[in-house]
Amino acid sequence: LIQERRSHEVNPAAHLTGANSSLTGSGGPLLWETQLGLAFLRGLSYHDGALVVTKAGYYYIYSKVQLGGVGCPLGLASTITHGLYKRTPRYPEELELLVSQQSPCGRATSSSRVWWDSSFLGGVVHLEAGEEVVVRVLDERLVRLRDGTRSYFGAFMV
Amino acid sequence: LIQERRSHEVNPAAHLTGANSSLTGSGGPLLWETQLGLAFLRGLSYHDGALVVTKAGYYYIYSKVQLGGVGCPLGLASTITHGLYKRTPRYPEELELLVSQQSPCGRATSSSRVWWDSSFLGGVVHLEAGEEVVVRVLDERLVRLRDGTRSYFGAFMV
Amino acid sequence: LIQERRSHEVNPAAHLTGANSSLTGSGGPLLWETQLGLAFLRGLSYHDGALVVTKAGYYYIYSKVQLGGVGCPLGLASTITHGLYKRTPRYPEELELLVSQQSPCGRATSSSRVWWDSSFLGGVVHLEAGEEVVVRVLDERLVRLRDGTRSYFGAFMV
């Protein structure tokens, strides 16, 4: 069977949710809740912010981040970059998979104006067993966490 | 078969579209077209705005709403919340699944400026047979319906 | 087997990426990279910007486009429309499937302000063998291509 995963085994899927510990401020990828509430892992693993592939194949990967602020933090670039990146033993650098750039601060016409914005990414990529996918947001100071429903990260085999 | 749904039966899927009757103005969830045009139900049911699950499993659920206006309606909060919510007999309240907050009015720098924005949500959640998923938008006055292509709601089992 | 595609054959999927040649300026649909980098076709074909269906069924189709600019180009309408459209021998006109309208220029409060925005669309539609799906952006002058990660187009059977 070319697609034998369909008949005898669980189709890999995961949905990870934002938590208080998601933002490390260290320049690393976002960290995620894997078990509580809506979060789950099924046929995928997790390690230090990364979804780790157990079974090679094509995966629809997705992430949403909730952005928000009051005006724009001093020194904040006008661009926020939200991306999904692949780490593979085959290459020394992280590889960009899906990326968005937004300028949400520009919505606030005064420095005291509260604003909210959301960035969603989703697409199909091929992943080998052992490869990892992470989410990065630059500048992560504008990511607004609450209860795991507004910022999240997931995947499923297609 | 762990994933027996894959071999002998249709994979549950649905895509519901926005219609003139979608916005009730009464605080309820959005209502949807289920049969005409692009709308369909396959292995899922519909009841008063809700997708109702027939077969338990993990579902990728999604919704998009088209927002628009001229300036900001008087008294409108600066935030629009677009969310997917679960109703289950196992819990007394609706449960937030996927939520976005946006401040689209802030894009219009004058009160007469026409603006458009779109909010997309999608993610994998576990649903039991008989549970419901609904879409809510607060404030729904800014949802712009047209022909079912700009605001919609769907799901499929993964 | 009602869903026989699941057990014995590859599940159709594709992910096409933005390239320098994507924007033709001719009013036609966006063109896409189909082989290099992250792009691939599996059980779907490609022709002049269009994903061509080989096997009838329900497909989750998606597209993201990266928008950006400095202020607003003179004469640019305040609305950008990003849509997925179907071409079918059964009907002389393209059919709108999923569409978003955005006013990203409104974010820039001065004519020299750099701004970025992103538009994501995704939903399930039924497609017959031989039917085509294309992506259109009006006005495409604001689409910002780079490396195939910011603007893309894909589909998979559900």
Epitope: - | T24, S26, G27, G28, P29, L31, L44, S45, H47, D48, G49, A50, V52, V53, T54, K55, A56, R87, T88, P89, P92, E93, E94, E128, A129, G130, E131, E132 | -
Partner: antibody, heavy 117, light 108 residues
Framework: EVQLVESGGGLVQPGGSLRLSCAAS????????MNWVRQAPGKGLEWVSY????????YYADSVKGRFTISRDNAKNSLDLQMNSLRDEDTAVYYC??????????WGQGALVTVSS | EIVLTQSPGTLSLSPGERATLSCRAS???????LTWYQQKPGQAPRLLIY???SRATGIPDRFSGSGSGTDFTLTISRLEPEDFAVYYC?????????FGQGTKLEIK
Amino acid sequence: EVQLVESGGGLVQPGGSLRLSCAASGFTFSRFNMNWVRQAPGKGLEWVSYISSSSYTIYYADSVKGRFTISRDNAKNSLDLQMNSLRDEDTAVYYCARSIAAAFDYWGQGALVTVSS
Amino acid sequence: EIVLTQSPGTLSLSPGERATLSCRASQSVSSSYLTWYQQKPGQAPRLLIYGASSRATGIPDRFSGSGSGTDFTLTISRLEPEDFAVYYCQQYGSSMYTFGQGTKLEIK
């Protein structure tokens, strides 16, 4: 804790009217669909009427159509059933019940309505 | 209108035995809209099973629901003394809800 408390039951003559109320607490009433279900003495359950969370959709059983009117006030967390042209066969315990899809997950304790001359 | 017929009308069993209650619909019912309730004398009904097979909160796992189309079953794997009551199936379709006439489960 979810509570549904019916009131307004009593004895009424055939052809008369009665208004039942149901006070809801312990959940966000405005977000849920509600129903009235009745049970005649020694008999089974019979669904009477349904109202969606926004009052946009209302259904009635054929046996009460044109005589009963369901309504709700989300600001007051209350559900009502106005019963007119009452008949002997309307004698029953009337329950208010919350619904999710087809499941009535929370029920009140019931209010007895007796129609008799 | 969809008519639900429950059988048997009365079921006499002893604690520890297995109970199988049937609910047959006059036309096909979506399994998402098939529900089972338990009712004891002087009490309101209690939700047991929704969506044909999902157990409600606090319902012991000895209760299970199955079936599709027109034939649905409530099974109590090992009867406890507190399980003796009247059981109703119920469905939603065509803008109305209907109940079966009930099955009385009594101690043998």
